[in-house]
C-alpha cells in the first residue's frame, strides 16, 4: 500500500487558447485531470488502473500552483494504491477549461481541453521528487512526482506491513526496510521478550518487564541465586530450594530440636557451669554456696549441719563457726572431754567406754543420730536421691525432686528417650546414657533414619535440554526442572512462541 504523489508547479498558456486553437472567453479557467495506470509502451486511452484525481480550477491561463500540503489542500495530488508497487507506471495529465462551475466530464464541451501530456517509465519508491517539464506548441507544464509508502508499509514496493507498538504483543519501532527494531530492554523475533536485570539467574529467574528479576518458586534475592528453606524449617538454611540444613546446635528434620540448650537458654544461675546432656537436657554444676537444679538456691554453709555433739552453727562471711556445748571442743565440736560417767548420751542412747574410759561412743536409738544422739535423723543427709535429684524433707518422710530425664522414688530410673519412637522408617532405638541412637534399616540414614539413601533416580541423566534433575525421595522417581523454552516430563518438547509466563 502506498501513494503516488503529483505536485503541479506551474502551467503556462500565454495566449489563453484551447487545444483547438480557439481562445477562451474571457480567459482559460484551468483545472487538471490526472490518470495513473499500469505501464504501457504506448500510452493509450482506457481504464486508469492505478487511479484518477481531479483538481478544482487552479488559475487562469498562466499561473504557478501553490503547495497546499501543509494546509490540508490538494497539492501535491494523492493517488493511493492498495497493492505492491510494480516499479513502472503510465501517467496522463489533462488541462481543461471550465466555462462554468460544473467540472464533471459530461458537463463540459468536448473542445474544452487545453492540453494533454502522457509519460511512462520506471519509478522506485522513495522520498525524492522527480522534476519534469512537458512543453507543447502552446502550453508548458512543470511538475514533480514520487511514490511513497502508506503509514505502516515499508520496503522497495511498499509490500511489508510494520506497525510500531509497545504492548503485550511487542515493543518495537520499524526500520526503513520494514524490519522490527526493538525498544530498549526488549528482545526476540517480535520484541516480546524482556531483557532481565543483568546477572539475573538464567534458570531461577525471569522477568515480565525490562531490568526486572523475578524469582521462580523456591528462590530469592536480587538475582534469584539464593534458595528459600523449607516452610517448616526453624533453625536451618538451604543450598537448594525447600531444604533445611540445621544451624549449629540444632537437629531434627525441621531443625527444631535444641541440641545446645546451654547456649540457647543459659539455664544455670549464679555462675554455674552448664553441660548439654541430650535434646533439651542439661546439667548445672553449682559454685560453692549454691544448690538447686539450676543452682538458683543460695546455700547457707550451716545448712549441712557441720557442728557435732550439739554444737550450734553461726554463718560467717568466710564460712561458719561452731559454738560447742560444755565438754566438747574442736572445729566441729568433734572432740569430747566427757566420759560415760557424765551420761553424755541423749534420747535414750546407750554409752560405751573407749580407750580405757578416756573416750566414749553413744549407740543411738532409731530416729536419732549425732555423737551424743542429740539430733533427730535428717532423712536427706544420706543423699538418697540418685542422678543429681534434690532431696526434700516432708515431716516424717522425704521425697526426691528429679532432674529432667530421670524418674522413680530415688530418681534412679532413666526416662527412656526411645519412648517417643523417634526413629523414622522402622529404625531401631537404643537408649544411651546421654540420649539415644537409631539403627536404620537399609536405604535410610541420618540421626533419626530420616534421610532416604536409596537408588538415585537421576543417575541415568533422564532429563533433556540441560534440565535440572531432582530425585523424589518418597517415590524413588525423578522430576525434571525444565529450562525456559522446554516442557514435558523429561523437558523433551520445545515450547512454541510466544510463551506465557515461562515456568
Amino acid at each position: 500500500s502506498g501513494v503516488f504523489q503529483l505536485q503541479l508547479q506551474e502551467f503556462i498558456n500565454e495566449r489563453g487558447v484551447l487545444a483547438s486553437g480557439r481562445p477562451c472567453e474571457p480567459g482559460c479557467r484551468t483545472f487538471f485531470r490526472v490518470c495513473l495506470k499500469h505501464f504501457q509502451a504506448v500510452v493509450s486511452p482506457g481504464p486508469c488502473t492505478f487511479g484518477t484525481v481531479s483538481t478544482p480550477v487552479l488559475g487562469t491561463n498562466s499561473f504557478a500552483v501553490r503547495d497546499d500540503s501543509s494546509g490540508g489542500g490538494r497539492n501535491p495530488l494523492q493517488l493511493p494504491f492498495n497493492f505492491t508497487w510494480p516499479g513502472t507506471f503510465s501517467l496522463i495529465i489533462e488541462a481543461w477549461h471550465a466555462p462554468g462551475d460544473d467540472l464533471r466530464p459530461e458537463a463540459l464541451p468536448p473542445d474544452a481541453l487545453i492540453s494533454k501530456i502522457a509519460i511512462q517509465g520506471s519509478l522506485a519508491v522513495g522520498q525524492n521528487w522527480l522534476l519534469d517539464e512537458q512543453t507543447s506548441t502552446l502550453t508548458r507544464l512543470r511538475y514533480s512526482y514520487r511514490v511513497i509508502c502508506s503509514d505502516n508499509y515499508y520496503g522497495d514496493n511498499c509490500s511489508r506491513l510494520c506497525k510500531k507498538r509497545n504492548d503485550h504483543f511487542g515493543h518495537y519501532v520499524c526500520q526503513p526496510d520494514g524490519n522490527l527494531s526493538c525498544l530498549p530492554g526488549w528482545t526476540g523475533e517480535y520484541c516480546q521478550q524482556p531483557i532481565c536485570l543483568s546477572g539475573c539467574h538464567e534458570q531461577n529467574g525471569y522477568c515480565s518487564k525490562p531490568a526486572e528479576c523475578l524469582c521462580r518458586p523456591g528462590w530469592q534475592g536480587r538475582l534469584c541465586n539464593e534458595c528459600i528453606p523449607h516452610n517448616g524449617c526453624r533453625h536451618g538454611t538451604c543450598s537448594t530450594p525447600w531444604q533445611c540444613t540445621c544451624d549449629e546446635g540444632w537437629g531434627g528434620l525441621f531443625c527444631d530440636q535444641d541440641l545446645n540448650y546451654c547456649t540457647h537458654h543459659s539455664p544455670c544461675k549464679n555462675g554455674a557451669t552448664c553441660s548439654n546432656s541430650g535434646q533439651r537436657s542439661y546439667t548445672c554444676t553449682c559454685r560453692p554456696g549454691y544448690t538447686g537444679v539450676d543452682c538458683e538456691l543460695e546455700l547457707s554453709e550451716c545448712d549441712s549441719n557441720p557442728c557435732r555433739n550439739g554444737g550450734s552453727c553461726k554463718d560467717q562471711e568466710d564460712g561458719y563457726h561452731c559454738l560447742c556445748p560444755p565438754g566438747y571442743y574442736g572445729l566441729h565440736c568433734e572432740h569430747s572431754t566427757l566420759s560415760c560417767a557424765d551420761s553424755p548420751c541423749f534420747n535414750g542412747g546407750s554409752c560405751r567406754e573407749r580407750n580405757q574410759g578416756a573416750n566414749y561412743a553413744c549407740e543411738c536409738p532409731p530416729n536419732f543420730t549425732g555423737s551424743n544422739c542429740e539430733k533427730k535423723v535428717d532423712r536427706c543427709t544420706s543423699n538418697p536421691c540418685a542422678n543429681g535429684g534434690q532431696c526434700l524433707n516432708r515431716g516424717p518422710s522425704r521425697m526426691c525432686r528429679c532432674r529432667p530425664g530421670f524418674t522413680g522414688t530415688y530418681c534412679e530410673l532413666h526416662v527412656s528417650d526411645c519412648a517417643r519412637n523417634p526413629c523414622a522408617h522402622g529404625g531401631t532405638c537404643h537408649d544411651l546414657e546421654n540420649g539415644l541412637m537409631c539403627t536404620c534399616p537399609a536405604g535410610f540414614s541420618g540421626r533419626r533414619c530420616e534421610v532416604r539413601t536409596s537408588i538415585d533416580a537421576c543417575a541415568s541423566s533422564p532429563c533433556f535440554n540441560r534440565a535440572t534433575c531432582y530425585t523424589d525421595l518418597s517415590t524413588d522417581t525423578f522430576v525434571c526442572n525444565c529450562p525456559y523454552g522446554f516442557v514435558g516430563s523429561r523437558c523433551e518438547f520445545p515450547v512454541g512462541l510466544p510463551p506465557s509466563f515461562p515456568w
Partner: antibody
Framework: EVQLVESGGGLVQPGGSLRLSCAAS????????MAWVRQAPGKGLEWVAT????????YYRDSVKGRFTISRDNSKSTLYLQMNSLRAEDTAVYYC???????????WGQGTLVTVSS | DIQMTQSPSSLSASVGDRVTITCRAS??????LAWYQQKPGKSPKLLIF???NLADGVPSRFSGSGSGTDSTLTISSLQPEDFATYFC?????????FGQGTKLEIK
Amino acid sequence: EVQLVESGGGLVQPGGSLRLSCAASGFTFSNFPMAWVRQAPGKGLEWVATISSSDGTTYYRDSVKGRFTISRDNSKSTLYLQMNSLRAEDTAVYYCSRGYYNSPFAYWGQGTLVTVSS
Amino acid sequence: DIQMTQSPSSLSASVGDRVTITCRASEDIYSNLAWYQQKPGKSPKLLIFDTNNLADGVPSRFSGSGSGTDSTLTISSLQPEDFATYFCQQYNNYPPTFGQGTKLEIK
C-alpha cells in the same frame, strides 16, 4: 514455637504515616524471607510487600509502590513496614508473615489494625 | 496478575460430611498453590502447599489435589473446629494472589 507479634497499628488521617513492627521468635530470623499481607475489613487477603533474607531485596504490590517501605533488622529479629501517604483504601488488618512472593506464607502473626480516616 | 476464583463462595455442611472447595487460576500455576484456614478474629493458618503437601501439624482429613489451573481442597470428615473461611493462593507468578475465600458454615 514460632511467634510473630505485630505492633504499631492505629488510627491515622489520610496522608499520614505509620510504622508497623513485627517481632519474630522461635526460628532463625536472618535465614528466612519475610512479608506483609493485609486484609480489609470483611474482605480477602492481599499481599503487600516482601523482603529477601539474603540481600534485603524488596518487592511491593503496585498500589503501595513509592509509599510503603519494608525493611528488617536481623540483629533484633524484627520486620518493619513504613507506611507514608496513607489512603482510606489502606485500611486493613496487617499481618506479618514468613514467606516470599513465590513461596507459601508458612507462619502468620496475630495482625495489627490500621485505620485511615479523617 | 493471575486471577484466583474460588467456588463456592459459601457452603453449609454438617459434622462428618465430606466437603470439597475448588480454586481456578486464570492461567497455569504449575502446582504452586497453597490453602489457608482462617477463623473469625484470627490470623490465617497454612494447611496445604504445593497443591497437595500437608503443612506440619495439619490433620490428615485435609487433602489437596489438582494440576494446571484447577485445584481442590477436600475435608474427608468435617469436625466442629473446621468451620472457618478457606483461601487459596498461587505463588507461581508475581505478584502472589489469593482467592476471594470460601466460608464453611454449620448446616
